[in-house]
Interface confidence: medium
């Protein structure tokens, strides 16, 4: 583990798994509210690579509800509203940290977990594989 | 807090702030690898709304370095490579959980924090405001 002189005022951990198991304050501080109160947008409808949002729920996880983007089309929407299949709608994926109850159903013991979510879609030029 | 009957075998928390302060195993489990290997992509270059990645650093946070997407253009890139200013490149934002040391410099006590990051960009039809 890390050899750090313990500051007075630091919580002490007697857990044999320290420093893998630590105390975490779940009174989640949100750094965004003051700077960006209006986060939700209608980009999912206005994008040339529009997407639908699907609800993924798991009561053993925090956050328990995660919304996943699914691109509506394989291609991208043109100005006339038709789909251009020479372009591709692709999901922009991102890993997020979540907390999973471990052991299951225990209210105050968690494991950090990384999960991959699709946040939205973007329109890209396809990669063309030329056959010799 | 969550009203869950305590299982035998669950760690006990004597913390007066329970369940705000919990034990978290930091041995991060990755749900992606087996089912969905990382597909970190070159979409940032191939998108009609391409973006650059900018470094944001904070040593008291995990992860300490976060690379944020910044759209390259106000408009969107057309097939001929020119920018179409009748369309808009906009950032897709997502909240992620990060860990912050609290009290500062304490090695085994953390607070979860939500921050808003720009993950990538998408091309949208602009909202036109007609002046009477």
């Amino acid at each position: 583990g890390i050899a750090i002189p313990r500051n007075s005022g630091c919580p002490n951990s007697e857990d044999k798994n320290f420093p893998r198991t630590v105390m975490v304050n779940l009174n989640i501080h949100n750094r965004n509210t003051s700077t960006n109160p209006k986060r939700s947008s209608d980009y999912y409808n206005r994008s040339t690579s529009p997407w639908n949002l699907h609800r993924n729920e798991d009561p053993e996880r925090y956050p328990s509800v995660i919304w996943e983007a699914k691109c509506r089309h394989l291609g991208c929407v043109k100005a006339d509203g038709n789909v251009d299949y020479h372009m591709n709608s692709v999901p922009i994926q991102q890993e997020i940290l979540v907390l999973r109850r471990e052991p299951r159903h225990c209210p105050n013991s968690f494991r950090l977990e990384k999960i991959l979510v699709s946040v939205g879609c973007t329109c890209v030029t396809p990669i063309v594989h030329h056959v010799a | 807090g969550i009203a869950i009957p305590r299982n035998s075998g669950c760690p006990n928390s004597e913390d007066k702030n329970f369940p705000r302060t919990v034990m978290v195993n930091l041995n991060i489990h990755n749900r992606n690898t087996s089912t969905n290997p990382k597909r970190s992509s070159d979409y940032y270059n191939r998108s009609t709304s391409p973006w650059n990645l900018h470094r944001n650093e904070d040593p008291e946070r995990y992860p300490s370095v976060i690379w944020e997407a910044k759209c390259r253009h106000l408009g969107c890139v057309k097939a001929d490579g020119n920018v179409d200013y009748h369309m808009n490149s906009v950032p897709i934002q997502q909240e992620i959980l990060v860990l912050r040391r609290e009290p500062r410099h304490c090695p085994n006590s953390f607070r979860l924090e939500k921050i808003l990051v720009s993950v990538g960009c998408t091309c949208v039809t602009p909202i036109v405001h007609h002046v009477a």
Partner: antibody, heavy 126, light 107 residues
């Protein structure tokens, strides 16, 4: 400018232990990790293990499990690698490297070794 | 464990020539592949991260491409100072591994 300065060359006998230090300066220490990589004479690079300073979480390559211990001291911004039960096969240059632990292009804790120490030459001989 | 293979093992090149080094992973590693240059008696130096991202301070003649299992490092217009050994490095799964290296010599 980030700099990693390692302790000096060592000559050891088989069965002895080795402890190398890696002092970091010029950047945040707690926000990063330190990995250890070795290179036997005329050979390629071999990852031994690494530590995430923020948590003190350590990962070791299976090959070195039980023989290697990686620690760090935030107060002196120094990482350490201890290797026990030395044999002549452990004769190598040992490098420490900074592991940024970044959130990159949508992924947590991605790793590339962006700064390296100058290397510590270790000779194990009876 | 992910095994990286590099080709060629050795390349002797004339200055201003284009050099291509390939790295193949035994499993899909996405874009978690980095390239390092090591000159004799020096520490490795990061050239390219995440398959294709350039590093500030590294000359623009160095570029990388690929994803999944096949990756390429390209030196467009080799210079005398580019002599050394080039390693690919995967950080997708533990244990992290390096390729065996490609030695580039100047003719």
């Amino acid at each position: 400018e980030v700099q990693l300065v390692q302790s000096g060359a060592e000559v050891k006998k088989p069965g002895e232990s080795l402890k190398i230090s890696c002092k970091a300066s010029g950047g945040s220490f707690s926000g990063y990790g330190t990995s250890w990589v070795r290179q036997a004479p005329g050979q390629g690079l071999e990852w031994m293990g690494g530590i995430t300073h923020f948590f003190g979480a350590v990962d070791y390559a299976q090959k070195f499990q039980g023989r290697v211990t990686i620690t760090a001291d935030e107060s002196t911004t120094t990482a350490y690698m201890e290797l026990s039960g030395l044999t002549s096969d452990d004769t190598a240059v040992y490098y420490c490297a900074r592991d940024p632990n970044e959130f990159w292009n949508g992924y947590y804790a991605t790793h590339d070794f962006d700064y390296w120490g100058q290397g510590t030459t270790v000779t194990v001989s009876s | 464990e992910i095994v990286l293979t590099q080709s060629p093992d050795f390349q002797s090149v004339t200055p201003k020539e284009k050099v291509t080094i390939t790295c193949r992973a035994s499993q899909n590693i996405g874009a978690e592949l980095h390239w390092y240059q090591q000159k004799p008696d020096q520490s490795p130096k990061l050239l390219i991260k995440y398959a294709s991202h350039s590093i500030s301070g590294v000359p623009s003649r160095f570029s990388g491409s690929g994803s999944g299992t096949d990756f390429t490092l390209t030196i467009n217009g080799l210079e005398a100072e580019d002599a050394g050994t080039y390693y690919c490095h995967q950080t997708d799964r533990l244990p992290y591994s390096f390729g065996p290296g490609t030695k580039v010599d100047i003719k």
